[in-house]
């Protein structure tokens, strides 16, 4: 018995084969002996049954003078999972149909983190397995449904799903879109009163996208985190709906999702998280932001350095005379120097030799004030 | 413990409507390709309707086709059987069963493993 | 459709002794075959499935053979509990079918 499969709403082509290579009398059947269609030997094909009955079965003329009679079923259903039969030269062939379809069982597009069920539409009767494999190369395997959770943003693209029955399989391709932002974390160092840029781009594109969204802020030297900005989102507009006074952020009007903030002040110095809830979807897509802030200064014959907000152990913070070796340099997040001498001071904060934020001071001989270019 | 439990049998004229639930619980339902199998008085086991899990692909039998709709909410874990002009011979119990398999390498075994006790109907004048 | 026919209708054992059961599938079914038990007023219970595995829980006095129109169900020395009603069941081909039934009773 020859074993065919199929994709549901595809075409599948059932073989029969004539021993002589030539044209000659031939009947496809269902099991159940209803005729589907033939040739009689006059080289035209004879439909069994009513045109919109039969309509979905053909054969392939061009291959009848090859010995070659198959049947053609196009839109294939699930329903047409049986066994045909093939009659020609006082023989029969049976040949098995199975059509399947593997689709995912909720939207598409999922947000990060969520879970992606993929399901085996088979008909009665079959006994698939199927494995798939994600856009990163990850493989799962299994019965009748196949589920992946915690969707990662490499798990966007084409999710490749093999049907395996009796040893033949049958390839699905299916567009997955996992929708997120393109960094799940971002870190911005700014100077003291330096203007600062937060940018949230998305890491998906789609033709309207509709939802609403919040940064909360926990600054580092406050109790509690606060609500800096709530903003609504309609076909790719952004539209302000409630911000803090202090600080008077604004924002963009347009993808990607862009803050600014007047001027980095210590007391701002901390950890956000911007939410997006998009429209028709469960769950919040997510974005940590951290804003660190350095200030140096010099009272009287202290010259110092401080940073403010979420840094790393390692990051080193120094001070040290233009051209010269650092005259201190450690892992805390304020270093000095005491009666430093005159000349282009700079404060740097670095991550393994790399500087992350510098911020440059000028000490006078001791008789006049410090400038700060 | 894996439990499939019917309801919503009952007592209908010829030609009146039923429905029947069947809830399910100690397994992850929307896994499952689910069926209703009912058995008349007396009588041996008919097959009656095959849903796959997401619901997309249903098969009935020819006597209930047309008349007959296997649905189900995986939010709810809870199976469906609408049954619409009912006829005396579709008196019977009707349970509810679960499609399960086994694996031997890439080889698939399914079978029809866990069943609920079935919830009676009955159709007369 | 497939028509399944068993045999014995009815079979009469005495406990302790072999019992064996027939079925016959009108087409080829391959393994898709299983066996049921269903004592009275029970849901029918899964023995045997894909001709010869027996299912979670059940005695190793079960035992399936055959393959595409001919099966048989073998219990090898039957306990008091095992007297019920076997039903054969092919998942070849839509619609499922199942036999007419056989009932194993007490000699």
């Known amino acids: 018995k020859t074993l065919v499969l199929g994709k549901e709403g595809e075409s599948a082509e059932l073989p029969c084969e004539s021993s002589q290579k030539k044209i000659t009398v031939f009947t496809w059947k269902f099991s159940d002996q209803r005729k589907i269609l033939g040739q009689h030997g006059k080289g035209v094909l004879i439909r069994g049954g009513s045109p919109s009955q039969f309509d979905r079965f053909d054969s392939k003329k061009g291959a009848w003078e090859k010995g070659s009679f198959p049947l053609i079923i196009n839109k294939l259903k699930m329903e047409d999972s049986q066994t045909y039969i093939c009659e020609l030269e006082n023989r029969k062939e049976e040949v098995e149909l199975w059509v399947f379809k593997v689709t995912a069982n909720s939207d598409t597009h999922l947000l990060q983190g969520q879970s992606l069920t993929l399901t085996l539409e088979s008909p009665p009767g079959s006994s698939p397995s199927v494995q798939c494999r994600s856009p990163r190369g990850k493989n799962i395997q299994g019965g009748k449904t196949l589920s992946v959770s915690q969707l990662e943003l490499q798990d966007s693209g084409t999710w490749t799903c093999t049907v395996l029955q009796n040893q033949k399989k049958v390839e699905f391709k299916i567009d997955i879109v996992v929708l997120a932002f393109q960094k799940a974390s971002s870190i911005v160092y700014k100077k003291e009163g330096e203007q600062v840029e937060f940018s949230f781009p998305l890491a998906f594109t789609v033709e309207k996208l509709t939802g609403s969204g919040e940064l909360w802020w926990q600054a580092e030297r406050a109790s509690s985190s606060k609500s800096w900005i709530t903003f609504d989102l309609k076909n790719k507009e952004v539209s302000v709906k409630r911000v803090t006074q202090d600080p008077k952020l604004q924002m963009g009007k347009k993808l990607p999702l862009h803050l600014t903030l007047p001027q980095a002040l210590p007391q701002y110095a901390g950890s956000g998280n911007l939410t997006l809830a998009l429209e028709a979807k469960t769950g919040k897509l997510h974005q940590e932001v951290n804003l660190v802030v350095m200030r140096a200064t010099q009272l009287q014959k202290n010259l110092t350095c401080e940073v403010w907000g979420p840094t790393s152990p390692k990051l080193m913070l120094s001070l040290k005379l233009e051209n010269k070796e650092a005259k201190v340099s450690k892992r805390e997040k304020a270093v000095w120097v005491l009666n430093p001498e005159a000349g282009m001071w700079q404060c740097l904060l670095s991550d393994s030799g790399q500087v992350l934020l510098e911020s440059n001071i000028k000490v006078l001989p001791t008789w006049s004030t410090p400038v700060q270019p | 413990q894996v439990q499939l439990v019917e309801s919503g049998g009952g007592l209908v004229k010829p030609g009146g409507s039923l429905r029947l639930s069947c809830a399910a619980s100690g397994f992850t339902f929307s896994d499952y390709y689910m069926n209703w199998i009912r058995q008349a008085p007396g009588k041996g086991l008919e097959w009656v309707s095959y849903i796959s899990s997401s619901g997309k692909t249903i098969f009935y039998t020819d006597s209930v086709k047309g008349r007959f709709t296997i649905s189900r909410d995986n939010a709810k874990n809870s199976l469906f059987l609408q049954m619409n002009s009912l006829r005396a011979e579709d008196t019977a119990v009707y349970y509810c069963?679960?499609?399960?398999?086994?694996?031997?390498?890439?080889?698939?075994?399914?079978?029809?493993?866990?069943w609920g006790k079935g919830t009676t109907v009955t159709v007369s004048s | 459709e497939i028509v399944m026919t068993q045999s014995p209708a009815a079979l009469s054992v005495s406990p302790g002794e072999r019992a064996t059961l027939s079925c016959r599938a009108s087409q080829s079914v391959s393994s898709k075959f299983a066996w049921y038990q269903q004592k009275p007023g029970q849901a029918p219970r899964l023995l045997i499935y894909?001709?010869?595995t027996r299912a979670t829980g059940i005695p190793a006095r079960f035992s399936g053979s055959g393959s595409g129109t001919e099966f048989t169900l073998t219990i090898s020395s039957l306990q008091s509990e095992d007297f019920a009603v076997y039903y054969c069941?092919?998942?070849?081909?839509?619609?499922?079918?199942f036999g007419q039934g056989t009932k194993l009773e007490i000699k």
């Open positions: 069941h092919q998942y070849k081909n839509w619609p499922y079918t």
């Open positions: 069963a679960r499609e399960d398999y086994s694996n031997y390498e890439d080889y698939y075994y399914y079978y029809t493993g866990v």
């Open positions: 894909n001709a010869s």
